[in-house]
């Protein structure tokens, strides 16, 4: 569910304090059965 360009080094932002993971994983989606 995302489009990503570039890298995700996240060299400056303190992601812990921002509440966001440094490089969030793609949410897994289950195929409709």
């Amino acid at each position: 569910s995302e489009t990503t360009t570039g890298t995700s080094s996240n060299s400056s932002q303190s992601t812990s304090n921002s509440g966001l993971a440094p490089n969030p994983t793609n949410a897994t989606t289950k195929a409709a059965g």
Partner: antibody
Amino acid sequence: EVRLEESGGGFVQPGGSMKLSCVASGLTFPNHWMNWVRQSLERGLAWVAQIQLKSDNYATRYVESVKGRFTISRDDSKSTVYLQMNNLRPEDTGIYYCTTGTDYWGQGTTLTVSS
Amino acid sequence: DVVMTQTPLTLSLTIGQPASISCKSSQSLLYSDGKTYLNWLLQRPGQSPKRLIYLVSNMDSGVPDRFTGSGSGTDFTLKISRVEAEDLGIYYCVQGTHFPYTFGGGTKLEIK
């Protein structure tokens, strides 16, 4: 004190375009990921887009429903993040908040897409 | 997408009563760095959301210590030891582990 101030909302017809802006103060802007979040009565709070840092080559992420229609960008020299919205749909209606993550939020700007 | 399910939908309490809000995620929010990116927000009437808690249990500055966050994996709880008038509004959980980041539907706290 951190302040995020959005502007640019208004009324637009389906298929139209709008550009939102958010000016930040009280923080080292180039060091923060910036995000747009939409709030609507029908869908509640929903993340829309994210732009990362210069050191990340300004990586961007978009929620599926706005891919190809919305573009997030930033101007670190102006401490400003933008959201260019094209081919707008009624379901894009809502209050758009600029956020640094989950920690700091602007007051929001309202977009109404209707014929 | 990760579905965040909050219960109850509404809490109607008198001043001084305790409150408990549950948030369950459809996938584990434990990230590879060992941290769990689960946040709690409060949106007071007519205002934008304000964060209360991040990383499950870390309180933001200025947040009264009557608020506590707990949980792990997929089950999380926000507790208010004694509700005060200023606590009214809608509480949201939001996860920052998986993209797209997703929010719970909200729990409205009303003061009787």
